[in-house]
Interface confidence: low
């Protein structure tokens, strides 16, 4: 009995996840199934024989990428009841041809918050552009946008930013650079300084539990889809 590779996938209530599965070389039926609690059997969720389980109709798609030897299953409009253990597989017998185990966890219990990230490749003279933007943290009831920062929720000391009130015109079809907050233009700093500032700002944001858990949302820890690393600088 061979041990299946395992992948963990996390998503938000109402959001969507993409499950990445290995594609066998020979052309056979491929599927995603869900393990039934208690019985141990795996019931087909979607397969290439045009089957879609009733409760997934209209919100699941299976796409094959033979050249990459993988197939992707996207599940949208996630509900808490979608949390569970799934398996990818190939073959006519759903219970027999499993190739990978997938644990899906759908979260809804936390408040997302804006998460700032340092930008290692930005020169220090580059002013923050601003058209639609929030300060790092405007006040105890103001905007912070990106998912989940660490620690306890609740009592957050207000941090006030003065801000420019000039409206930026937008006709040359280019978003102009401008300062963000305060009297002097704020500039990007070298990554080490920016990291320290980000860490400091993190202490001032509305905060939520299980930082490590939530910041991996929608990310498969194995078979990471795509080549992006954290270097994108976008939380």
């Amino acid at each position: 009995l061979r041990i299946l590779p395992e992948v963990k996938v996390e998503g938000e209530l109402g959001g969507s996840v993409t499950i990445k599965c290995p594609l066998p070389e020979m052309h056979v039926r491929i599927y995603l199934c869900r393990e039934m609690a208690g019985s141990g059997t795996c019931g087909t969720v979607v397969s290439t024989t045009n089957f879609i389980k009733a409760e997934y109709k209209g919100r699941v798609t299976l796409k094959q990428y033979p050249r990459k030897n993988l197939f992707l299953v996207e599940v949208t409009q996630l509900t808490e009841s979608d949390s569970g253990v799934y398996a990818c597989g190939a073959g006519m017998n759903t219970d027999r041809g499993k190739t990978q185990k997938v644990t899906l966890n759908v979260h809804s219990e936390y408040e997302p918050s804006w998460e700032e990230q340092p930008m290692p490749e930005t020169p220090k003279w580059f002013h923050l552009p601003y058209l639609f933007q929030m300060p790092a943290y405007a006040s105890s009831s103001k905007f912070v946008t990106r998912v989940t920062t660490p620690a306890q929720r609740g009592k957050v000391p207000p941090v006030h930013h003065s801000s420019p009130t000039t409206q930026i015109t937008h006709r040359p079809r280019v978003s102009r650079a401008s300062s963000v907050a305060g009297d002097k233009p704020r500039t990007f700093l070298p990554s080490t300084t920016a990291s320290k500032i980000s860490a400091l700002e993190g202490l001032l944001k509305p905060q939520t539990p299980s930082y490590n858990h939530h910041t991996r949302l929608h990310r498969q820890r194995a078979l990471d889809y795509g080549s992006q690393s954290g270097r994108e600088g976008q939380g």
Partner: antibody, heavy 125, light 112 residues
Framework: QVQLQQSGPGLVRPSETLSLACSVS??????????WGWFRQSPGQGLEWIGC???????YTNPSLKSRVSLSIDQSRQRFSLNLTSATATDTAVYYC?????????????????WGKGTTVTVSS | QSALTQPASASASLGASVKLTCTLS???????IAWHQQQPEKGPRYLMK???????SKGNGIPDRFSGSSSGAERYLTISSLQSEDEADYYC??????????FGGGTKLTVL
């Protein structure tokens, strides 16, 4: 299918309060997976973020407007609202309500996955 | 300096393909963007999120004719088999350290 239905007056007098509401169908305003927000687009201009509200009532606003903006959420009526006080001619714009979804792939971002149809508001005497 | 730059206009024939460009400014070449469509007299519509590696995830109901790709600081939106309803303004949008919902100026697409 999530839909956002906007309502509010098309004409507001200067110095009065601009009030708009956005009724949500197909999703709960209390759903902790979303933010609900407002943008506006002035004639010939780009889109400007006004503010957002979360299921628990926490509000976030554009710093350039924050002294005049108030946002609220009404769970029983399945809607969220925008009030912009001391309206001036520069507030003349098409106002959009939106739903924002956190999405993580290799990085996380918030994207607008549903837009209201927009309400044209003219501030004039 | 600008965060996002888009050509003011583009045109292509009915049934043909068109590739719209959004250029990220220096130091932002690794950023992902989102593409939005705004048809005349209508509100914007989310099309897709496009990563620096070219992978993308589309919004609900967005036809397969719309696809995204990336090269360096350039982000592309390709629309194939152009239809008359594709005539619209297309905005790219990004987010990042201290910048949120920054939109490019938009490209007005004319279908000939």
């Amino acid at each position: 299918q999530v839909q956002l239905q906007q309502s509010g007056p098309g004409l507001v007098r200067p110095s009065e309060t601009l009030s708009l509401a956005c009724s949500v169908s197909g999703a709960l305003v209390t759903n902790t997976a979303y933010y609900w927000g407002w943008f506006r687009q002035s004639p010939g201009q780009g889109l400007e973020w006004i503010g957002c509200i979360y299921a628990n009532g926490r509000t976030y606003t554009n710093p350039s407007l924050k002294s005049r903006v108030s946002l609220s959420i009404d769970q029983s009526r399945q809607r969220f609202s925008l009030n912009l006080t001391s309206a001036t001619a520069t507030d003349t714009a098409v106002y959009y309500c939106v739903r924002l979804v956190p999405k993580r792939t290799a990085t996380l971002h918030y994207y607008i996955d549903v837009w209201g149809k927009g309400t044209t508001v003219t501030v004039s005497s | 300096q600008s965060a996002l730059t888009q050509p003011a206009s583009a045109s292509a024939s009915l049934g043909a393909s068109v590739k719209l460009t959004c250029t990220l400014s220096s130091g932002h070449s690794s950023y992902a963007i989102a593409w939005h469509q705004q048809q005349p007299e209508k509100g914007p519509r989310y099309l897709m999120k496009l990563n620096s590696d070219g992978s993308h995830s589309k919004g609900n109901g967005i036809p397969d004719r719309f696809s995204g790709s990336s090269s360096g600081a350039e982000r592309y939106l390709t629309i194939s088999s152009l239809q008359s309803e594709d005539e619209a303004d297309y905005y790219c949008q990004t987010w990042g350290t201290g910048i949120h919902w920054v939109f490019g100026g938009g490209t007005k697409l004319t279908v000939l």
